[in-house]
Structures are given as C-alpha cells and as structure tokens.
Interface confidence: medium
C-alpha cells in the first residue's frame, strides 16, 4: 500500500494539534485549507513542537514534501537571522528552532519563497517556489484546552471514536481539543456521546463523567437525542445540542439556525432570532434590509490610491498613468523604467545554460544557491483547463514551436473564494478586454465603474481600509484577520507567462522546477535558537489599523469581474507597467474565484523597498482579503530546469553554514 494513500491524521497535545493532510496542494491552497478548518499551516517553533511533528509525519515516503507555515516575501532576505527573513504565516518571526536542509544562500532573493518539510529522513526544511503543488501539508490547531482520551471501560464494545473540530475522526488521540466529540459504543447495544466542553469551575472536560456503559437513562438510542443526552439527577433525560445548534421544538433534534437564515453573506448563530447576519469587510449592511450587504466604495476615501482608483464589488484597484508604474505596495506610482527592468533583459541566453562554463554565468544569479535544488519537475504543459496557478514547477514543458506571446502577470492575488459556497457576484460582462489610457479611459459599457482620480494625502486612522476577503463568505469572522491582500485576475485558458528564453521560444512555462535540494545533501542543520525578535523587526502583518503607505501614484485602474474571456490585444493605448510585454495589464479579467484557478494572495510588504521592481511587476489590485500568505504572482520561468547537486552544508556554531562548494543553481525563474 502506498503510504500516501493514507487518510489525514493528527497528533494532539494539551493545547494544540498538528494534522497531516496527504493532499497535493500549492502553498496557498494548503494555507486556505488549514484556515477553513480553523487552524493555520504548522509553525514548529521549538524542538518540542518539532518532535511532535516528527512523530506525526513519521518515516514517510522518500521524495515527498509537506508545506509548513513559513513564507518569505521577495527581497526580504535576512540571512543572518534564524528564519532567514522568512515569516510564520501567523505573522511573526519568533522561533527557537530551525531545520534548514541547505545553507543560507547569498543574493537578493528577488522572489517569494515558501518552506516545505521533507516527509522522510530528518524532516528538514526546504525552501522553494510557493506555486508548486507538493504532496501534502501540515496544519496546526490551537485551542483553549483539551480533554484527555477516555479510559476504556469493561462494558465498551470498542474504543471511543473521536471527532475533532477540524473534522478528523480517529480512535488514536491522546488529547482531544475543546469541541471534540467522543462516541462510545457499549456492548449492551447502546452508546454514549460526549462533548469536550468548558467546565463551570474552569478548564475543559468531558460533558459527562463515567462510567458510560452502565445504567439506562439515556439508553437505548442516546435517549432519542440527536446530539447529546443528559441524565438528570431524578433519572429523566434531557437533550442538548452542540455549540452553534439549538434544540428544535421536539426537544430532541437539533437545528442550525443559520441553515434557513436569509443572510446574503455571513450568518452567526445567536441573537434574538437565533441568528445574526454579518457582511464581509468591504461591504456593509444595506440600510433598508440588514440581511443584505452593499459594497463599500473605498475610492471615496482620500488618498487610497496615489493617482487613480476604481471601486468594484468587494474591492478596489489603483492604477498609474502612462509613464508611471505601480509600485509593490499597490498604491504608489513611480516613473517607469526604474530599476528591475534590465534584470530580465539579459536572461534569455543564460536560462538554459547547462552550467558547464561558470565563467559565463551572470554573477547576480550565481548567488542563488539556497532554495530547492531544481529538479525538473513540472515542465510547463499546455493547459487543458485553467491551471491552478499560472506557474507550478519543475522544468517547463515545451510546447508549440511558434514563439508564445508573453502576457504580463499580476503579482497580487485574487480575493479568496468561498471554500464551500459557490461564489456569485454581480460581475461585469465584457465582450473584449478593456484597455484604458491615462488620458482617455475606454469603458466597456455603461455598467463600468467610474474611474476616480485619487487625491494624495496620507490616510488618517479612521480612513484606513480594512481589507478582508470579499470572496470568503463562509469563514467565521474570527478567522478573518484584517490584512491587506490584493486580487489577481484570472488568466485566460491560453495564457502563457512571459517567456524569458530567447534561445528556446518553443518552450513555454507551465510547471516550475521544484526548487528542492538534492536529497544527497549532507549535514542537516538542526539548530536551536533563542526565541525573540530583533527590536527593529517589523513583522509582515498589516493589521486593520496599520498605516497604508501615504504616497500614491497617478494610476488609473480598471478592473472587470467577468467570466473568463480570452485576452485580445487591441490597438488602444495600453497602460505602462513594469512588464515589457505587448499586452496591457488592463486586459485583466477577473473570474469568480470559485471558478478560476486559485491565484496567490499577497500581504502588502511593509519592508519592501519601493523603488525596487521585479522583472515583471504588474498591477496590484487591492482586494479585501484576510491575512493570507503572499504569493508573488506568476513570474517568468525557465523553460527547463537543469539542476546540479546541492552544496553540502557545513554547520557552524550558529547552525547556519557557508557553501562548502559553489553549486550552480537555476533560481532564475524568480
């Protein structure tokens, strides 16, 4: 049996659980999956936590990887620090443990990177491109307390079956998080159902004390109760419902008050009617009907964009006028042609360099010795349906022999889609892409939102935009931290990311080579660090009250939400962006997230130098999204990955190591 055919499994302690999901996902998809269950990607910060992860992962198959919650934004290297500039998805950089598989590399680290854990061996940490769908992911769930596993009783028909709040069912838990249900079957044919609940005296415990398989109060058939049967002192039974449900009129069954609630967006049990309706951030309750939600127009907020702003349902977007380009903050504009454009100019001849002649290598690229060794992984392949992401790894698959038209790729993600509820938005219908010139905006129809020039003053505290995912209807508000993210329009089915290789135009990117280290790397670096963050560290978390960068560029934004349409170049003037590509970023057509491949969300990087541009730095639409890991959008990638053996790490006193030898790496897709 292939061990990876296993079901998800978990290991719980008194205050948290780790769960392994052997499901192939990108970093963003994994992050979302953990969040939807109320957790986060695993953040093993101490040797003790790492040990728990090790015992859960066990000796998995060789060559398998699991995402953990570590991510680094572009140009955020801090190689001297234990986490090397990586940030936990919880938003901080505290750690007392690292387990890097590779020595830290020098270089400017121009692209976003994420960390995966080897499922075999010493479970080392490998850094690489976030868009690869690796073999699984580790989630972590924190809670207020846990109940110990029930002791087996003489009258039990079998072990207790536990169901956790994150939907894992097993008999193997040692601790059960608050909110778990234990089902005990007795030999007499009846059973008991217990809930791990808060106790009146404090702490948590099982809703009922043993013995469970004696007496007749709730027998047979759980006293007829749908959820929980309680034996009262006088011998009669009463039924109770688990949290979020209420007892129905029959006194036995339980109903979800939100199941029939007429809330347009979000519903929460409780309140006088049994439920209360809420709107996602970016929306507010309609004045005439509190069940409905109407869009908030952020473009009315002074200084939200430096130059021009367009509001759309659930979000807004900044654009710059011709001759300017949108900076990484998605708000500011700077004169076009600043640093960064040349970086990709001369790559073509090097991309497929077989590494025989190191003298020919561009020194700027030689520095990338750190990341996953480029295995050929997914060679780009022709899409048969929209791909999960515009990139995915491994060496790109070549395709048709004609050169492909490179399209600019937004580097900011789309709003998160509803995990289970189909997303229906009042989207604009467009029959062709809209190209907007800075002087004469061309609007596709009368329904197009107005283009509003933005004023320049900095945002005051009360004008800061809480940006939480417009498309995340079913997450409880507790799971939606207020973090800036940006939407990323869908790519049309025939979309090709920009080509860098002039040598091999027939090779088009699709899957990026996994940047995983050669498994022959010697010298695992397992390092224990003192926890704590240097005082000048600013975590990459923009909270609801955080200042948005005040400088805003002269940009204009046009964003249409529509069903997926082909990009058709037109003769109309295109907006200037940092990508050197024939198609304007105004050709972005966003698709309801439920129908489009997930794109990659982005935090506004507070530490990123504003004058730095990556080789492709397209528009940064702002979407209201929870704090989600930033995924720099599809970058141009190599058509082929020609990796070479990873350097052997020679651990130093700090647990980091210099390169034992200079290994030529191909991180040039970044």
């Amino acid at each position: 049996q292939d061990p990876w055919a296993a079901e998800p499994r978990a290991a719980c302690g008194p205050s948290s659980c780790y769960a392994l999901f052997p499901r192939r996902r990108t970093f963003l998809e994994a992050w979302r999956a953990c969040r939807e269950l109320g957790g986060d990607l695993a953040t093993p910060r101490t040797p003790e936590e790492a040990q728990r992860v090790d015992s859960l992962v066990g000796a998995g198959p060789a060559s398998r990887l699991l995402w953990i919650g570590l991510q680094r934004q572009a140009r955020q290297c801090q190689l001297q620090r234990p986490l090397r500039g990586f940030t936990w998805t919880t938003g901080d950089q505290d750690t007392a443990f690292t387990n890097w598989a590779q020595p830290a590399s020098g270089g400017p680290c121009p692209a976003q990177r994420c960390v995966a854990l080897e499922a075999s061996g010493e479970h080392r940490w490998l850094e690489g491109s976030c868009t690869l769908a690796v073999d699984g992911y580790l989630c972590q769930f924190g809670f207020e307390g846990a109940c110990p596993a029930l002791q087996d009783e003489a009258g039990q028909a079998g072990p207790a079956v536990y169901t956790t709040p994150f939907h894992l069912v097993s008999t193997e838990f040692e601790w059960l998080p608050f909110g778990s249900v234990a089902a005990v079957q007795c030999q007499a044919g009846r059973g008991a159902s217990l809930l791990c609940v808060k106790q009146p005296e404090g702490g948590v415990g099982w809703s009922r004390a043993g013995p469970l398989c004696l007496g007749t109060g709730c027998s047979p058939d759980n006293g007829g109760c749908e959820h929980e049967c309680v034996e009262e002192v006088d011998g009669h039974v009463s039924c109770r419902c688990t949290e979020g449900f209420r007892l129905a009129a029959d006194g036995r069954s339980c109903e979800d008050p939100c199941a029939q609630a007429p809330c347009e967006q979000q519903c929460e049990p409780g309140g006088p009617q049994g439920y209360s309706c809420h709107c996602r951030l970016g929306f507010r309750p309609a004045e005439d009907d509190p069940h409905r939600c109407v869009d908030t127009d952020e473009c009315q907020i002074a200084g939200v964009c430096q130059q021009m702003c367009v509001n759309y349902v659930g979000g807004f977007e900044c654009y710059c006028s011709e001759g300017h380009e949108l900076e990484a903050d998605g708000i500011s504009c700077s004169p076009a042609g600043a640093m960064g454009a040349q970086a990709s100019q001369d790559l073509g001849d090097e991309l497929l360099d077989d590494g025989e002649d190191e003298e020919d290598e561009d020194e700027a690229w030689k520095a990338f010795n750190g990341g996953w060794t480029e295995m050929p992984g997914i060679l780009w392949m022709e899409p048969t349906q929209p791909p999960d992401f515009a990139l995915a790894y491994r060496p790109s698959f070549p395709e048709d022999r004609e050169p492909q038209i490179p399209y600019p790729e937004p580097t900011w993600p789309p709003p998160l889609s509803a995990p289970r509820v189909p997303y229906h938005s009042s989207v604009l219908s467009v029959t062709r892409p809209v190209v907007v010139s800075a002087t004469h905006p061309t609007l596709p129809s009368a329904h197009q939102p107005p283009v509003i020039p933005a004023t320049h003053p900095a945002l005051s505290r009360d004008h800061q935009i809480p940006v939480i995912a417009a498309n995340y209807p079913d997450l409880p508000s507790a799971y939606q931290p207020g973090i800036l993210s940006v939407s990323h329009s869908a790519q049309p089915p025939a979309h090709q990311p920009p080509m860098i290789s002039t040598k091999y135009p027939e090779l088009f990117p699709a899957h990026q080579s996994p940047m995983f280290p050669d498994t022959r790397v010697a010298g695992t670096q397992t390092t224990t660090h003192l926890p704590g963050i240097p005082p000048n560290h600013a975590p990459l978390v923009t909270t609801l009250g955080a200042q948005l960068p005040p400088q805003a560029p002269d940009a204009l934004v046009l964003r249409t939400q529509a069903t997926q349409l082909p990009i058709i170049p037109t003769a109309q003037p295109s907006l200037t962006t940092t990508s050197r590509s024939p198609v304007s970023p105004a050709h972005q057509i966003s698709v309801p997230a439920a129908t489009q491949p997930a794109a990659l969300p982005t935090l506004l990087p507070s530490q990123s130098p504003t004058n730095q541009t990556s080789p492709i730095s397209p528009t940064h639409p702002h979407s209201k999204a929870p704090q989600i890991p930033r995924e720099d959008g599809p970058s141009p990638k190599l058509a082929l990955w020609l990796p070479s053996p990873a350097p052997t790490a020679a651990p130093t006193a700090l647990g980091e190591a210099g390169l034992a030898e200079h290994s030529q790496r191909d991180d040039r897709w970044l």
Epitope: W4, A5, G355, E374, M381, D388, R394, L642, S644
Partner: antibody, heavy 120, light 107 residues
Framework: EVQLVESGGGLVQPGRSMILSCAAS????????MAWVRQAPKMGLEWVAT????????NYRDSVKGRFTISRDSAKNTLYLQMDSLTSEDTATYYC?????????????WGPGTMVTVSS | ETVMTQSPTSMPTSIGERVTLNCKAS??????VDWYQQTPGQSPKLLIY???NRHTGVPDRFAGSGSGRDFTLTISNVEAEDLVVYYC?????????FGAGTKLELK
C-alpha cells in the same frame, strides 16, 4: 498496493483511432501526475505523454503531438490515451506509469502494458 | 532533444561480480536521471531516481551516481536475477528520453 492496469489495446488499421485506459488503485490518484510510455517490439522505451495531477496541463513527444490526447478522470481513477491517425510507427506495448513525486519526474510504478498493433 | 547514450550495449559478467553501467547525456541534465530495470515480458521497475537515490525496496547492491552529463549505475554483487536490461532516463529537458539499454548477461 499500488496497481495500474492498462486496457484497450489490440489490432487497428492505419489511420484509425483507438483509446487506451489505465485503471489505478491503491493510491490517491488525484495526487499524482501520470504518463504513458511505449516500447516498440524488441526496442527501447519511449515517453509518450504526461498529464498533471489535476489534469490542467499535458505534454507530448513531438511525433504524437496533435494525434494523441492524454486525459484523466479522477472520479473513476482512470487515465486515458486517445490515439488518432495511427501509423505503423505507433505499434508498441503502451505502459501507464505514475510520476512518483510532486517535484521529480521519475516513474515509480508501471502497469503491465497493453499491446497496440497498427497494421492493415 | 537530449540523447542518452548507454554503454556498453551488452555487459558480460559473472555472479558476484561488480559491474558499472554508464549513461551519457548529450547536454547537462543536472541530477535528473533515473535507472530502470526491465525483465523480459515485464514492465520496467524503478531502481534509482535523481541520479543517486534508491527507490523503496531496491536492494542496496544497486547504487547510482553522477550529475551533469555522466551517470553510472553500479551493481556491487551481481545476482542471477540481475541479468536483465537496464535503461537510464533523463527528465532535465523535454522530451523525456531513455537510453537504448544495456543488457547484463553471463560471461
């Protein structure tokens, strides 16, 4: 136990079409990229096509591009190879193979193969 | 395409001997080379992936090495069941290409 079983082979006339199937079991089919590899009688191995785990991307060797289509149905745990405009050069045993990793392209499990003979 | 040249085409050996099979790529493929074993009438079996990593269940008498263009498969103590055909595969560039094979046979 990981199992791949090909079917659909046989004798076909040049210019005609044929579809091969590969039934997968013993692993989470939707987690793995899959491929077809062929071997002409008394000859070596030749990679034909690969499809990603989610079916979103495919690739083919030049000699079959435009004639062969690789596809998958994760609900049925089945991989397909639609072969059109067959020629005698396509005569071979066709193996269904699993790419064993999310980031390496090695083939860790192979089916027993199904023989396709293109002859008039 | 990247051509994989295997040598020798046929390798006479004796039981218990140590043999080395070679595979040379026409261009650098990093460590993206595998070795497969094929018994007549059966499908190929993965022995070594990414140049040097033994697949699950493969006896440790099989070892792979190399990177760039030159790769070797070493069988340290040949057994009777090893007298079959061995193929190398590269996936550092498209199309994926196999070598023509080396047949291990008794002297």
């Amino acid at each position: 136990e990981v199992q791949l079983v090909e079917s659909g082979g046989g004798l076909v006339q040049p210019g005609r079409s044929m579809i091969l199937s590969c039934a997968a079991s013993g692993f989470t089919f939707s987690n793995f990229d899959m491929a077809w590899v062929r071997q002409a009688p008394k000859m070596g191995l030749e990679w034909v096509a690969t499809i990603t785990y989610d079916g979103s991307r495919t690739n083919y060797r030049d000699s079959v591009k435009g004639r062969f289509t690789i596809s998958r149905d994760s609900a049925k745990n089945t991989l397909y190879l639609q072969m059109d405009s067959l020629t005698s050069e396509d005569t071979a045993t066709y193996y269904c193979a699993r790419h064993g990793s999310s980031y390496y392209w090695f083939f860790d499990f192979w089916g027993p193969g199904t023989m396709v003979t293109v002859s008039s | 395409e990247t051509v994989m040249t295997q040598s020798p085409t046929s390798m006479p050996t004796s039981i218990g001997e140590r043999v080395t099979l070679n595979c040379k790529a026409s261009q650098s493929v990093g460590i993206n080379v595998d070795w497969y074993q094929q018994t007549p009438g059966q499908s190929p079996k993965l022995l070594i992936y990414t140049a040097s990593n033994r697949h699950t269940g493969v006896p440790d008498r099989f070892a792979g090495s190399g990177s760039g263009r030159d790769f070797t498969l070493t069988i340290s103590n040949v057994e009777a069941e090893d007298l079959v055909v061995y193929y190398c595969l590269q996936y550092g560039s498209l199309p994926f290409t196999f070598g023509a094979g080396t047949k291990l046979e008794l002297k």
